[in-house]
Interface confidence: medium
């Protein structure tokens, strides 16, 4: 099995993690993709996933996580907005290919979120973010919550990430065609 590697991203609270996971265009363009968290000694857990089949450039939002799959470029864009210290952890992009094991897109993302100068939970005092409550929905989750932690034998291209400051944070009210999916049960 390929050795697992990590890329570390250190951000401040209130900032946005913007990760782009590359995949093999012809093979996986319409495959369902997911963003997962990995906890020590446990199976990866899916936090959000694209539709099945995955739609081109169609934003899917699960709380503060937004996924966009760009078929033309062979990349899955993952954004986690309004980052909080509690979001720190190890994450990965995967491609679902049932009945086979999910195909992991290297590298894993080690996210470290530290306090901004204002030290607020999920905010920076300079940020224009809104804290709001999304009403619960009964929509069925579109993706499996747990997947096997087995590694893949082929290492696709590395993921890349950009850091957005709170001032340049996206405004969620401007995201169109958003699907709200409760992925935790």
């Amino acid at each position: 099995a390929t050795k697992l590697t990590e890329e570390k991203y250190e951000l401040k609270e209130g900032q946005t993690l913007d990760v782009k996971c590359d995949y093999t265009l012809e093979k996986f363009a319409s495959s369902q993709k997911a963003w997962q968290i990995i906890r020590d000694g446990e199976m990866p857990k899916t936090l959000a996933c694209t539709e099945r089949p995955s739609k081109n450039s169609h934003p899917v939002q699960v709380g503060r996580i937004i996924l966009e799959d760009y078929h033309d470029h062979g990349l899955l864009r993952v954004r986690m907005v309004n980052l909080q210290v509690e979001d720190s952890g190890l994450y990965q992009c995967v491609i679902y290919q049932p009945p086979k094991e999910p195909h992991m897109l290297f590298d894993r993302i080690r996210l470290v979120v530290t306090k901004g100068f204002s030290g607020t939970p999920g905010s920076n005092e300079n940020s224009t973010q809104n804290v709001y409550k999304i009403p619960p929905t009964t929509t069925k989750a579109l993706c499996p919550l747990y997947t096997s932690p087995r590694t893949v034998t082929q290492a696709p291209p590395k993921s890349t990430a950009d850091v957005s400051t709170p001032d340049s944070e996206i405004n969620l009210t401007n995201v169109t065609d958003i699907i709200r999916v409760p992925v935790f049960n």
Epitope: K45, L47, G63, I65, E86, K115, P136, F184, N185
Partner: antibody
């Protein structure tokens, strides 16, 4: 409708431990933060600590550090608070409360759901 | 730890009165403040979060304001159901401390 149901009242001896459970139903579990708050008879509210089940990590008030352990079992949607080396001053009603999540802020939206409370009496 | 100081500790008022409760933080907490109502033998109930956002289902006579270190909870016209104890709580940093409480009683 979201409900947090706590375990029943306990009577404990000084020096012993107590473990209170908080089972969530009617909603999600892992995507929220669960905190524990206690209230001694006739006193105010005191924050003890919290856990975000999906991350598995807990934060504790310094006052209880080393004596309290907060855990969560996602398979049963249950959070636990264990307090050790009990003394008479620990006699209180212990509440679990839910807040935030990926939809907004883990804690910034306050505790919107509370358990019914568990009375723990420490007496020799 | 951030200290939260509520005043007054007890407030006597009549139905229909406009009631204001103050909560002061020992350091700036931005807008990370919640207000709760608690009745004897019951769990607290969330009224306001992020200093001024009204929780769903809470009557509009309740409102919150302030930022930084000084916050207020206002009940525009006190109703019989409002006689209770009110607490503020900061979510700026761990531990998430509460104020000492304000008991609103019948005059």
């Amino acid at each position: 409708q979201v409900q947090l149901v706590q375990s029943g009242a306990e009577v404990k001896k000084p020096g012993s431990s107590v473990k209170v459970s908080c089972k969530a139903s009617g909603g999600t579990f892992s995507s929220y933060a669960i905190s524990w708050v206690r209230q001694a008879p006739g006193q105010g509210l005191e924050w003890m600590g919290s856990i975000i089940p999906i991350f598995g990590t807990a934060n504790y008030a310094q006052k209880f550090q080393g004596r309290v352990t907060i855990t969560a079992d996602e398979s049963t949607s249950t959070a636990y608070m264990e307090l050790s080396s009990l003394r008479s001053e620990d006699t209180a009603v212990y509440y679990c409360a839910r807040s935030g999540g990926y939809s907004s802020s883990w804690y910034g939206t306050g505790y919107d759901y509370w358990g019914q409370g568990t009375l723990v009496t420490v007496s020799s | 730890d951030i200290q939260m100081t509520q005043s007054p500790s007890t407030l006597s008022a009549s139905v229909g009165d406009r009631v204001t409760i103050t909560c002061r933080a020992s350091q700036s907490i931005s807008s990370w403040l919640a207000w709760y109502q608690q009745k004897p033998g019951k769990a607290p109930k969330l009224l306001i979060y992020k200093a001024s956002s009204l929780e769903s289902g809470v009557p509009s006579r309740f409102s919150g304001s302030g930022s930084g270190t000084e916050f207020t909870l206002t009940i525009s016209s006190l109703q019989p159901d409002d006689f209770a104890t009110y607490y503020c709580q900061q979510f700026q940093s761990y531990p998430f401390t509460f104020g000492g409480g304000t008991k609103v009683e019948i005059k």
